[in-house]
Interface confidence: low
């Protein structure tokens, strides 16, 4: 007996009721929301003489579908309508003429949960493989982006920070990256699964948060990672250590206190207090000009805001409650179609601007 015919006998759960129509597919697959999965699938059907030259059409249906009434979720038949909610996301990736019924799901959504069965049609030979069926489980997105900071962050020196989602799949809708940082930044190039932020830190940016937020618009799900910036000011011999962080990737960080202009802890504390006071006054003054407040998790641009092409300063929004002197969180808003941007921020020179402002850079 040829191997082809032995396979369905060896595979557990591979046989449908009909010994000459069999299908092998894993009975359950789990995919995180917004991500993708490729489910390998093989099927076999007898080929009568008169159907040998007929094209083979494959279809994936939701469990309970009525073939004559309901559209499939995926098919290789070009003129066949598919379910609207799965269009472009479910794809019969395998070639049915080669006994391949592999199913690709991208931008997985919660409502994709459920069971699916495969059907083949070749001329007058038509068969729905009701067993085994494929059960799809869509779970919470637990993956988080990784932020890579190469080398040491030094005041006034630009560094490229990379936020990557290497776990995302190539076939899915490219995610939207948003950066939120207090430090002066501009947006560097991006790839399908990574975004570069060019940061030119100041001494006062040490210890502030930097967040990379990634939104998978195809599924409407968002994930983010926040790290603390470690700015090392080293006029002479720098020493670096590894920041423990949260396992988000390598980050070279400061080893000790900021050296240089300030001589002692008392002076440092006094200056910090003054800076805080000055900042509070500036913040109160600027609050009057603010019209809207946007939380840092909001990745959608506010309507009516200036394009980065026309703004010299990042737009200041109302303050968010904070226990530190980090201040308000203005949002730099970008055109939807803008993939790469170079943004000009004020306060690039730490000696001229001691206040802290947050800027959010968004790219699609």
């Amino acid at each position: 007996m040829p191997l082809l015919l032995l396979l369905p006998l060896l595979w557990a759960g591979a046989l449908a009721m009909d010994p000459n129509f069999w299908l092998q597919v894993q009975e359950s697959v789990t995919v995180q929301e917004g991500l993708c999965v490729l489910v390998p699938c093989t099927f076999f059907h007898p080929i009568p003489y008169y159907d040998k030259n007929s094209p083979v059409h494959g279809y994936w249906f939701r469990e309970g579908a009525i073939i004559s009434r309901d559209s499939p979720v995926a098919t290789n038949k070009l003129d066949q309508e598919v379910q609207e909610e799965t269009q472009g996301r479910f794809r019969l990736l395998g070639d049915p003429s080669r006994n391949n019924c592999s199913l690709s799901i991208v931008d997985a959504r919660r409502r994709d949960n459920g069971s699916y069965f495969f059907r083949m049609e070749r001329g007058s030979t038509k068969y729905s493989y009701k067993s085994p069926q494929l059960s799809v489980h869509v779970t919470d997105l637990t993956h988080r982006p990784k932020i890579l900071i190469p080398g040491t962050l030094e005041p006034g020196h630009s560094k490229n920070l990379t936020c990557s989602v290497s776990w995302a799949c190539e076939q899915g809708t490219p995610p939207i990256f948003s950066w939120l940082s207090a430090a002066p930044t501009s947006l560097g190039p991006r790839t399908t699964h990574s975004s570069v932020l060019i940061i030119t830190p100041r001494p006062q940016d040490h210890g502030t948060n930097l967040t990379c937020q990634v939104k998978f618009a195809g599924a409407g799900v968002t994930t983010e990672r926040t790290i603390q910036l470690n700015v090392t000011y080293v006029p002479q011999n720098p020493t670096t250590g590894i920041f423990p962080g949260d396992g988000s990737g390598k980050q070279e960080t400061r080893a000790g206190v900021v050296h240089g202009a300030i001589g002692g802890a008392g002076v440092t504390a006094l200056l910090a207090l003054c800076l805080c006071l000055i900042f509070f006054i500036v913040k109160t003054h600027r609050r009057k000009a603010a019209r809207t407040a946007v939380g840092r998790n909001d990745t959608h641009p506010t309507t009516g805001s200036a394009s980065p092409k026309h703004q010299k300063k990042s737009k200041l929004h109302g303050p968010t409650e904070t226990s530190s002197c980090s201040g308000a969180a203005p949002t730099v808003e970008m055109d939807e179609e803008l993939h790469y941007a170079s943004l000009n921020f004020h306060g690039m020179n730490p000696s001229k601007d001691t206040s802290t402002e947050y800027s959010e850079v968004r790219t699609q």
Partner: antibody, heavy 125, light 110 residues
Framework: QVQLVESGGGLVQPGGSLRVSCAAS????????MGWVRQAPGKGLEWISG????????TYADSVKDRFTISRDNAKNTLYLQMNSLKPDDTALYYC??????????????????WGEGTLITVSS | QAVVTQLSSMSGSPGQTVTITCTGS?????????LSWYQQLPGTAPKLLIY???NRASGVPNRFSGSKTGSLASLTITGLQAEDEADYYC??????????FGGGTHLTVL
């Protein structure tokens, strides 16, 4: 007791049509593959058509393709064969046959090869 | 058209062992597809004897056995009896015809 009883046979002119039926009893019809096999006078057996248990798959021998249509009504435990454009060569005893399981042909695996006694169809002018 | 060939007739004496053969091709018997043997007594409908190459159908005496080597299938009847006189057909799924019967062998018990 398993019974397959064919009916609807008779004399028909060339080019004419005929529908034969097969009433099943004594077994769970909806679980069985069913088919039609014919035997011309003094000749051997010729498989002509088959249908799987759910009715999704229908297959035909080259000699009857596009002229004959097999169907089944599981609620009525009945198998049908609609024959159009009949030719003298179609003259034969038509047997209804069934096999347990949704098999491709009537006797796979379990060996419960159920056969009716046949109905004679004569195509002649 | 796929062809499964059988000798048109054979004969044997009571008590003898006879072997009826059925020759197919890689698209049917040789392809590893299920093979069956049928017995058709004069004036009656066919009856399943052997299914899946060598499994006897219920009620079939163990004098009947089946085997297969490559594209050649065999039905062996040991201790031939007068009531074994009948037409014997092999049947197999075929890639080109879906199901095909051999031409049939008429066995005469002398």
């Amino acid at each position: 007791q398993v019974q397959l009883v064919e009916s609807g046979g008779g004399l028909v002119q060339p080019g004419g049509s005929l529908r034969v039926s097969c009433a099943a009893s004594g077994f769970t019809f909806k679980n069985y593959y069913m088919g039609w096999v014919r035997q011309a006078p003094g000749k051997g057996l010729e498989w002509i058509s088959g249908i799987n248990s759910g009715g999704e798959v229908t297959t035909y021998a080259d000699s009857v393709k596009d002229r004959f249509t097999i169907s089944r009504d599981n609620a009525k435990n009945t198998l049908y064969l609609q024959m159009n454009s009949l030719k003298p060569d179609d003259t034969a005893l038509y047997y209804c046959a069934g096999g347990e399981g949704s098999s491709w042909y009537p006797d796979y695996y379990y060996g419960n090869g159920y056969w009716g006694e046949g109905t004679l169809i004569t195509v002649s002018s | 058209q796929a062809v499964v060939t059988q000798l048109s007739s054979m004969s044997g004496s009571p008590g003898q062992t006879v072997t009826i053969t059925c020759t197919g091709s890689s698209s049917n018997i040789g392809g590893g597809y299920y093979l069956s043997w049928y017995q058709q007594l004069p004036g009656t409908a066919p009856k399943l004897l052997i299914y899946n190459v060598n499994n006897r159908a219920s009620g079939v005496p163990n004098r009947f056995s089946g085997s297969k080597t490559g594209s050649l299938a065999s039905l062996t009847i040991t201790g031939l009896q007068a009531e074994d006189e009948a037409d014997y057909y092999c049947g197999s799924y075929d890639e080109s015809l879906s199901y095909v019967f051999g031409g049939g062998t008429h066995l005469t018990v002398l």
